[in-house]
């Protein structure tokens, strides 16, 4: 099991993963479900007016390790959590906006929320 903050290299899944998508659904999605070889994610960020907006969807394996890393962006409050342990696992992800005073650190943790053990199949 990967705990919050523990770094993990993405590994190829043996099969496709279905994720819930909201505000981030690709053309091929049906009933707000997308498919990926990588991760499901849920993200919260502030829009231009400062209103929190939640989006969710699929991240391809390639580049997802970077994307799932909560690297601070100057003048932008954002938090992302990723998961792979079951289909639509991102329904249970609830990232929160970081407090403003914490936005001066350089490297954030990778947020892999696993509510169940993630068995790696070989």
């Amino acid at each position: 099991k990967k705990e919050d903050g523990e770094s993990t290299a993405p590994t190829a899944r043996p099969k496709v993963l279905r994720c819930k998508c909201h505000h981030h659904c690709p053309e091929d999605s049906v009933n707000n479900i997308c498919s990926t070889d990588g991760y499901c994610f849920t993200m919260i960020e502030e829009d231009d007016s400062g209103t929190p907006v939640v989006t969710s969807g699929c991240l391809g394996l390639e580049g997802s390790d970077f994307q799932c890393r909560d690297t601070p962006i100057p003048h932008q409050r954002r938090s992302i959590e990723c998961c792979t342990e079951r289909n639509e696992c991102n329904k249970d992800l609830h990232p929160t906006l970081p407090p403003l005073k914490d936005r001066d650190f350089v490297d954030g943790p990778i947020h892999h929320k696993h509510h169940h053990h993630h068995h790696h199949h070989h």
């Epitope: 043996p14 099969k15 496709v16 279905r18 690709p26 053309e27 091929d28 999605s29 049906v30 479900i33 498919s35 070889d37 391809g60 079951r86 289909n87 639509e88 199949h121």
Partner: antibody, heavy 117, light 113 residues
């Protein structure tokens, strides 16, 4: 080697239900999706639905959502499809098929379902 | 639902001839994020279950003879048998796995003269 074993035939009465089985062997059952496909005599192939044995997540073709229910028994590596309120239109060969990435790399031999009184 | 249309519905060829069959989809099967076409081809011999020949439009499944060649992109796809053999007598189906429900073409029946 990968095998998906299905009974050769089933004969059931109109209005009844039937539970078709598909026993998987030669691979890790939870590592792949299982699909069910219908083929009527001399006709094409229709996808009924899919189930991920690892978390029992299912997706159905809307056409079959009130007709078919997909389940698995992980302990015996067996997938099941229950069909209800059977009519002559349900007479067909039903295949189970395995997928990793939504194309079907192994198929069972099919169960010929006959609905007749 | 994506509609898959195959043509011709049947054809008769002599051993050694080149065979081409077409599969057209009602919308593009090309995913922009990875530039792959989500289309597969299957062979179904009489009395048997379907067998995977090609996936991602042009990737031959392991163990499939190299005379089977898949090509095409977007909405137009072709399965070519470069030199047909007697054992290729079968129905051939295309399938899209771009968007659920996964759908199949009506098939092309290949007969050997």
């Amino acid at each position: 080697q990968v095998q998906l074993q299905q009974p050769g035939a089933e004969l059931v009465m109109p209005g009844a239900s039937v539970k078709l089985s598909c026993k998987a062997s030669g691979y890790t059952f939870t590592n792949y999706w299982m699909h069910w496909v219908k083929q009527r005599p001399g006709q094409g192939l229709e996808w009924i639905g899919e189930i991920d044995p690892s978390d029992v997540y299912t997706t159905y073709n809307q056409k079959f959502k009130d007709k078919a229910t997909l389940t698995v028994d992980k302990s015996s590596s067996t997938a099941y499809m229950q069909l209800i309120n059977l009519t002559s239109e349900d007479s067909a060969v039903y295949y189970c098929a395995r997928s990793g990435w939504d194309y079907f790399d192994y198929w069972g031999q099919g169960t010929a379902l006959t609905v007749s009184s | 639902d994506i509609v898959m249309t195959q043509s011709p519905s049947s054809l008769a060829m002599s051993v050694g001839q080149k065979v081409t069959m077409s599969c057209k989809s009602s919308q593009s099967l090309l995913k922009s994020n990875n530039q792959k076409n989500y289309l597969a081809w299957y062979q179904q011999k009489p009395g048997q279950s379907p067998k995977l020949l090609v996936y991602f439009a042009s990737t031959r499944e392991s163990g499939v003879p190299d005379r089977f060649i898949g090509s095409g992109s977007g909405t137009d796809f072709t399965l070519t048998i470069s030199s047909v053999q007697a054992e290729d007598l079968a129905d051939y189906f295309c399938q899209q796995y771009y968007s659920t429900p996964w759908t199949f073409g009506g098939g092309t029946k290949l007969e050997i003269k």
